[in-house]
């Protein structure tokens, strides 16, 4: 019922060895159980964080400490809503070799989204 699930950016290119944080916004649900999926397999994320923006709006994070080749792929988040699984638009994570400059692409219809936060 009016569930809105978003992830951003649509394409993300990062340097190997860098940390990355993906985020996913869920609107229209109280206390969503946000799951992250990579290439069809659920990503176990024992220390996952949420930000409750409001009762009906939550943001979930997936933190990758140090990205390597095996982390490249298609990520999305999903939630159960009334017995059905709703999935977000996928985020494509691609890698460039360590030390190369990475470009972060996202489509403007997701401009309400900040980039995933990078930390050193």
């Amino acid at each position: 019922a009016g569930l809105k699930l978003m992830g951003a950016p649509v394409k993300l290119t990062v340097s190997q060895g860098q940390p990355v944080k993906l985020n996913c916004s869920v609107e229209g649900m109280e206390e969503p159980d946000i799951q992250w999926v990579k290439d069809g397999a659920v990503v176990q994320n024992l220390d996952q964080l949420y930000i409750p923006v409001s009762e009906q709006h939550w943001i979930g994070f997936l933190s990758l400490k140090s990205v390597e080749r095996s982390d490249a792929g298609r990520y999305w988040c999903q939630v159960e809503d009334g017995g059905e699984t709703e999935i977000s638009q996928p985020v494509w994570l691609t890698l460039v070799p360590r030390g190369s400059s990475a470009h972060h692409h996202h489509h403007h219809h997701h401009s309400a989204w900040s980039h995933p936060q990078f930390e050193k």
Epitope: K21, D47, Y50, I51, P52, E119
Partner: antibody
């Protein structure tokens, strides 16, 4: 103020069943996971497992899978650790810990900071 | 099953720098956390996500991580820092957490 109140110390015989509890207050229970940690007398900490904030999914450490059951009752903001058949080697202090979950910012570690005082379980014939 | 390896004990004189290491194959991919546990007390979070100091922890405590090794450093150790220190992290697939065996820090 965040508080995790654990049930009192217990002495049981081998083969007995036992459930210990951890009642949370001072925050929204369904915003966080709860983990359980074991510490045998004079020994180190061991992560046993955790239950997610919806009380719908549990994860266990390899040494504890099948030997204990973690559950939670959202209506009373209480997490539980249960044994069907205790062994002498279960004698230990058991801590509950508020784990991952809601935060006021993407990396602010409100998780793992709040521990219960521990419940001492003694299993002896 | 996955293991985190710490030295059983470290001794320093007051004012010296204490370094406690934690070794684990997944540490290049998974964050390390450090706990301090004083005798008869519940553990206290000292460092999270490799290097970030938890609230209320003195500046003399710092953390770092490189490759398969995480390190807790106490610059100018004080007598009140005597405690057991545990590192804590996830196994590589994120299926479960693990504590290191613990390091007893003596400041004498």
């Amino acid at each position: 103020e965040v508080q995790l109140v654990q049930s009192g110390a217990d002495v049981k015989k081998p083969g007995a069943s036992l459930t210990i509890s951890c009642q949370a207050s001072g925050y929204t229970f369904t915003d966080y996971w709860i983990s359980w940690v074991r510490q045998k007398p004079g020994k180190g900490l061991e992560w046993m497992g955790q239950i997610n904030r919806h009380a719908s999914n549990t994860m266990y450490g390899p040494s504890f899978q099948g030997h204990v059951t973690i559950s939670a009752d959202r209506s009373t903001a209480t997490a539980y650790l249960q044994w069907r058949s205790l062994e002498a080697s279960d004698t230990a202090m058991y801590y509950c810990v508020r784990s991952g979950g809601a935060t006021s910012g993407g990396t602010i570690p409100e998780y793992y900071q709040h521990w219960g005082p521990g419940t001492l379980v003694t299993v002896s014939s | 099953s996955y293991e985190l390896t710490q030295p059983p004990s470290v001794s320093v004189s007051p004012g010296q720098t204490a370094r406690i290491t934690c070794s684990g194959d997944a540490l290049p991919k998974k964050y390390a956390y450090w706990y301090q546990q004083k005798s008869g007390q519940a553990p206290v979070l000292v460092i999270y996500e490799d290097w970030k100091r938890a609230s209320g922890i003195p500046e003399r405590f710092s953390g770092s991580s490189s490759g398969t090794m995480a390190t807790l450093t106490i610059s100018g150790a004080q007598v009140e820092d005597e405690a057991d220190y545990y590192c804590y992290s996830q196994e590589r697939k994120g299926n479960y957490f693990v504590f290191g065996g613990g390091t007893k820090l003596t400041v004498l």
